[in-house]
Interface confidence: low
């Protein structure tokens, strides 16, 4: 006869690991006893059970409560064992040595892989602003054993660059993604991906990019002077930008005080009805806690009776 | 223009804690850190730490058990305590202003503080 | 921490000289390296940061290069009133400054 067992166990943190010992053998043979020994390289035998025909199973005291016989039906010629809630330092070298009749003792070694799923974490990197040069976006890590894979996925361009350290019994993977921020970047997802034996599916923690900016600011309203004429209701200037964090707008008049009358509202600038009071330098601030810029625009305000000759010159100009 | 200003007693006896104000005029210190870096007679500039306009500190870990910066906002005024010194201690102490990164755009010009009994 | 290694310690140069610098860091340190000059009972003026930026009213001499652990100062045409100590300094977590170059006249 001859002894069927596995080379390799693998079995995930906290589940219980089949240690497999199957005496195949010949019409009227018989298994007396199987005894089961751990047996790591340098480190001498240490007993686990003793599984006996006739008086059952005998469990060492280091692995009292720990390890068990397979639920019924049994076979007569089965010495597997059940080794309970299996921990990194279960991790080894196992023997199973069964006494036959009449054929004698035969014995059969295996390897019990414990595998330790990762717990990854995310860390952002620092505040990320639009004029950086390459920036740490976030780091990802993830310990377990075997080592994890930890990778990312995005539609960010950037470089990733990875280390790991290994511990007795496990290792830790850091991976860290670096990109040049820009505006473009902004609400994107980032996402670390970690892979691992231990792991039914892929592990992934997200972290959405926030990159600080702040768009040139212009001004829109003057772009057909002729409406700025005395009396004209409704005249508004309107400032352009864009920027995270959202940015706060403040106007001014460069050539003293606002006029009386004009309507701040955020990004607009609302006239009253025209007078040449109105006509000046009007700066849109624009701001937020990443920069500022500044525009300014120069509102002439026409007087149809002054102007219009200079109307007509204008219209037949462009 | 933003300038900084250290002041403080030049002298302190070993093992007292040596304190030292920077006082920040001309400019907003909102979005900005406050950093405190040393350099011993001769030698080379070491970095202490940072607070933000905020009240958040960062200290370089070598001297984080002996190194308090605080922040009075209302007077733009920010304090360096350094506690247990030696004469190992003796440099100029400069103020300086950065940005989130830490690189140092505008420095004080420097206190001695002599550490001797 | 990262430890920064600058060369060298001293050179002698002339007014007109092409004068290079260089600091290395322990690790990468990506584009995060500022240099700044230095002169007698003054405090550091920052010239150049974020690797090559150079700092508003820097003369255009001035320029800086690298990324990664190797770093290079250079100034194009030096004139006197560059002759001072030069220092880098890496802002990837706990800042450091080099040892320290000086610039010394011929």
């Known amino acids: 006869g001859e002894l069927e067992t596995s080379d390799v166990v693998t079995v995930v943190l906290g589940q219980d690991a089949k240690l497999p010992c199957f005496y195949r053998g010949d019409s009227g043979e018989q298994v007396g006893q199987v005894a089961w020994a751990r047996v790591d390289a340098g480190e001498g035998a240490q007993e686990l059970a003793l599984l006996h025909s006739k008086y059952g199973l005998h469990v060492s005291p280091a692995y009292e409560g720990r390890v068990e016989q397979p639920p019924p039906p049994r076979n007569p010629l089965d010495g597997s064992v059940l080794l309970r809630n299996a921990v990194q330092a279960d991790e080894g070298e196992y023997e199973c040595r069964v006494s036959t009749f009449p054929a004698g003792s035969f014995q059969a070694r295996l390897r019990l892989r414990v595998l330790v799923p990762p717990l990854p974490s995310l860390n952002p990197g620092p505040a990320l602003e639009e004029g950086q040069g390459l920036t740490l976006a976030a780091s990802c890590t993830a310990e377990g054993s075997p080592a994890p894979s930890v990778t990312w996925d995005t539609e960010v361009k950037g470089t990733t660059s990875s280390r790991s350290f290994k511990h007795s019994r496990s290792a830790a993977v850091t991976s860290e993604f670096h990109l040049v921020p820009s505006r473009s970047m902004n609400g994107q997802p980032l996402t670390c991906v970690v892979s691992h034996p231990g792991l039914l599916q892929d592990q992934r923690i997200t972290h959405i990019l926030h990159v600080s900016f702040l768009a040139e600011a212009s001004v829109r309203g003057l772009e057909d002077q002729n409406l700025w004429h005395i009396g004209r209701e409704g005249a508004m200037l309107k400032c352009l930008s864009e920027g995270q964090p959202p940015p706060s707008y403040n106007w001014t008049r460069l050539d003293g005080p606002l006029p009386s009358g004009v309507r701040v509202d955020g990004d607009t600038l609302g006239f009253p009805p025209l007078t040449t009071e109105h006509s000046g330098i009007y700066v849109c601030h624009v701001s937020n806690e990443f920069s500022s810029r500044d525009s300014q625009v120069t509102v002439d305000v026409l007087d149809p009776q002054e102007d219009s000759g200079k109307q007509v010159d204008l219209v037949s100009a462009s | 223009q933003v300038q900084l200003q250290e002041s403080g007693p030049g002298l302190v006896k070993p093992s007292e804690t040596l304190s030292l104000t920077c006082t920040v005029s001309g400019g907003s210190i909102t979005n900005y850190g406050v950093h405190w870096i040393r350099q011993p007679p001769g030698k080379g500039l070491e970095w202490l730490g940072v607070i933000w306009s905020g009240g958040s500190t960062d200290y370089n870990p070598s001297l984080k058990s002996r190194v308090t910066i605080s922040v009075d906002t209302s007077k733009n005024q920010f304090s360096l305590k350094l506690s247990s010194v030696t004469a190992a201690d003796t440099a100029v102490y400069y103020c300086a202003r950065s940005g989130k990164w830490y690189y140092f755009d505008y420095w004080g010009q420097g206190t001695l503080v002599t550490v001797s009994s | 921490d990262i430890q920064m290694t600058q060369s060298p310690s001293s050179l002698s140069a002339s007014v007109g000289d092409r004068v290079t610098i260089t600091c290395r860091a322990s690790?990468?340190?990506?584009?995060?390296l500022a240099w700044y000059q230095q002169k007698p009972g003054k405090a550091p003026k920052l010239l150049v940061y974020?690797?090559?930026n150079l700092q508003s009213g820097v003369p255009s001499r001035f320029s800086g290069s690298g990324s990664g652990t190797d770093f290079t100062l250079t100034i194009s045409s030096l004139q006197p009133e560059d002759f001072a100590t030069y220092y880098c300094q890496h802002f990837w977590g706990t800042p450091t400054f080099g040892g320290g170059t000086k610039v010394e006249i011929k």
């Open positions: 690790q990468s340190i990506y584009s995060n």
């Open positions: 974020a690797a090559t």
